[in-house]
Interface confidence: medium
């Protein structure tokens, strides 16, 4: 969570002098309650907007908008505290609108906006607007909160943002997986325009079960520039275990911009149609447990083998 540093946020408008300040999320009115406090915000809306930085980067931002209730409490409204809480990390960031003049009328409905909180793909936030001063203990709450979920990098609009592009969102491998026979799987995908290696992670499952019955990792060396955007094919050798027929193929790139945290792409091959009276499938245990400190997958020629080519 962070704030855009450009352009400087503005909260002043016709009839109101105001400045935006960084906040510790602990307004003074918590510690020194006031007798009279304003009512809560009305019609809080959070929308996803996009902002360009001076460097030309494009970031998703939370656009926060709310209005004031048309009551006399605006005479006691000294500002607002905007808080954004990232739910999976409990990280919180706040800013404060500090009113430098008093609101005296409701000739038109007062409306406020703020679009400087930079948000992350595929994250959920709680956005709160507190009117200041905050209420006395046991007083009626004068804040409004809403949750806001940011789309992931698969979304067409998010795909072109800097954080998504940095994690490889523009690469579309267009994976195709074909079962050649009971022991061979052919994987085709499009290489990206970078000399970086890839890993193919194969996990096989019994029909209708989620415990893996075979796992295999295959390393693909970095392509040469003339191979960029070309199709690469890999033939993976499977363990010929009866019923171990549903295969998930995941391709993990190691682009320089995201290293081990690049977006992975998957494709799945279902088991062939089962006969009306299928034979019982035995329970399968994973063929190995990951070594501590190592990847969830490890290459092991005893478990399967593969070969690959790049197509021009």
């Amino acid at each position: 969570l962070r704030l855009l540093d450009f352009p400087a946020p503005v909260c002043a408008q016709e009839g109101l002098s105001c400045r935006v300040k960084n906040s510790t999320c602990l307004d003074d009115s918590w510690i020194h309650p006031r007798n009279l406090t304003p009512s809560s915000p009305k019609d809080l809306q959070i929308q996803l907007h996009f902002a360009h930085t001076q460097q030309g980067d494009l970031f998703p931002v939370a656009h926060i908008e709310w209005t004031l209730q048309t009551d006399a409490s605006i005479l006691y409204l000294e500002g607002a505290e905007l808080s954004v809480l990232q739910l999976n990390t409990n990280e919180r960031l706040c800013v404060r609108f500090e009113f430098l003049s008093k609101l005296r009328h409701h000739h038109r409905r007062w409306r406020f906006t703020f679009s400087h909180f930079v948000v992350d793909p595929d994250q959920e936030y709680e956005v709160t607007v507190h009117h200041l001063p905050k209420p006395i203990p046991d007083g009626d709450p004068n804040h409004q909160s809403k949750n806001f979920l940011v789309p992931d990098c698969e979304h067409a609009r998010m795909k072109v943002t800097t954080p998504c592009m940095s994690s490889g969102s523009l690469w579309d491998p267009n994976i195709t997986v074909e079962t050649l026979d009971t022991q061979h799987l052919r994987v085709d995908f499009t290489l990206w325009n970078e000399s970086t290696h890839y890993q193919i992670l194969l996990t096989s499952f019994p029909h209708m079960e989620n415990h893996s019955c075979f796992e295999h990792m295959h390393h693909i060396p970095a392509p040469r520039p003339e191979e960029f955007h070309q199709r690469s094919n890999v033939t993976l050798t499977l363990r010929n275990l009866k019923g171990c027929c549903r295969h998930q193929v995941q391709i993990q790139p190691f682009f320089s911009s995201c290293l081990n945290d690049c977006l992975r792409h998957s494709a799945t091959v279902s088991c062939p149609e089962m006969p009306d009276t299928p034979e019982p499938i035995p329970d399968y245990m994973p063929l190995w447990e990951p070594r501590s400190g190592s990847s969830d997958y490890k290459d092991d020629d005893d478990k399967g083998s593969s070969h690959h080519h790049h197509h021009h």
Epitope: Q47, H63, N147, H155, A156, R157
Partner: antibody, heavy 131, light 107 residues
Framework: QVQLQESGPGLVKPSETLSLTCTVS????????WNWIRQSPGKGLEWIGD???????NYNPSLKSRVTISVDTSKNQFSLKLSSVTTADTAVYYC?????????????????????????WGQGTTVTVSS | DILMTQSPSSLSASVGDRVTITCRAS??????LGWYQQKPGKAPKRLIY???SLQSGVPSRFSGSGSGTEFTLTISSLQPEDFATYYC?????????FGPGTKVDIK
């Protein structure tokens, strides 16, 4: 109430460049994506591309080599240029706004819709490519 | 590109009929789909957004459902002004693509 109005020549010669402008009135061009779509006679709708108010563009790969979309925020306008036109480019050209993204709250719980999609359209302008 | 298919391509119906149009996507698009109505010589008008949400000002006889790859537009009781061509649009993945359209005419 936001309104869009396409303008530009109705007749373009083959191999020349088609140029259209869309003027946005009744609202700001900021914080939206702005699209161009076309519809050939008796055919369906084809998305040409879009531009964010900041200038960031996306194009349909089938037309990418010939298309340029630009924006002029000071005039509340965005424009389409399609080069090397042929008779196959004869169509009604529409400009459209990509709807803002919002949260919609259901009873007792919230739901999220990242709804982009063309919510406001111009009335369209016919462009004929002919010598 | 995501291919959108619609069925039927045309249908004849009477006022008061219940009409259902289906749109299929060649790959999953979550609920990133809209339904549009177009009358001759006019621009398309959005009826449904996010697969199932009714556009403001659109009569409640129009409804949408579906998610992933299969979507449906239903007109519960067809009115004279509903005779038009209906298109679906996916905006999940660039390039955005429209269905080929379903023409609804008078029986």
């Amino acid at each position: 109430q936001v309104q869009l109005q396409e303008s530009g020549p109705g007749l373009v010669k083959p191999s020349e460049t088609l140029s259209l402008t869309c003027t946005v009135s009744g609202g700001s061009i900021s914080n939206y994506y702005w699209n161009w779509i076309r519809q050939s006679p008796g055919k369906g709708l084809e998305w040409i591309g879009d531009i964010y108010y900041s200038g960031s563009t996306n194009y349909n790969p089938s037309l990418k080599s010939r298309v340029t979309i630009s924006v002029d925020t000071s005039k509340n306008q965005f424009s389409l240029k399609l080069s090397s036109v042929t008779t196959a480019d004869t169509a009604v050209y529409y400009c459209a706004r990509d709807g803002e993204l919002a949260n919609y709250y259901g009873s007792g719980s919230y739901q999220f819709y990242y709804y982009y999609g063309m919510d406001v359209w111009g009335q369209g302008t016919t462009v004929t490519v002919s010598s | 590109d995501i291919l959108m298919t619609q069925s039927p391509s045309s249908l004849s119906a009477s006022v008061g009929d219940r009409v259902t149009i289906t749109c299929r996507a060649s790959q999953g698009i979550r609920n990133d789909l809209g339904w549009y109505q177009q009358k001759p010589g006019k621009a398309p008008k959005r009826l449904i957004y996010a697969a199932s949400s009714l556009q403001s000002g659109v009569p409640s006889r129009f409804s949408g459902s579906g998610s992933g790859t299969e979507f449906t537009l239903t007109i519960s009781s067809l009115q004279p002004e509903d005779f038009a061509t209906y298109y679906c649009l996916q905006h999940n993945s660039n390039p955005f693509t429209f269905g080929p359209g379903t023409k609804v005419d008078i029986k």
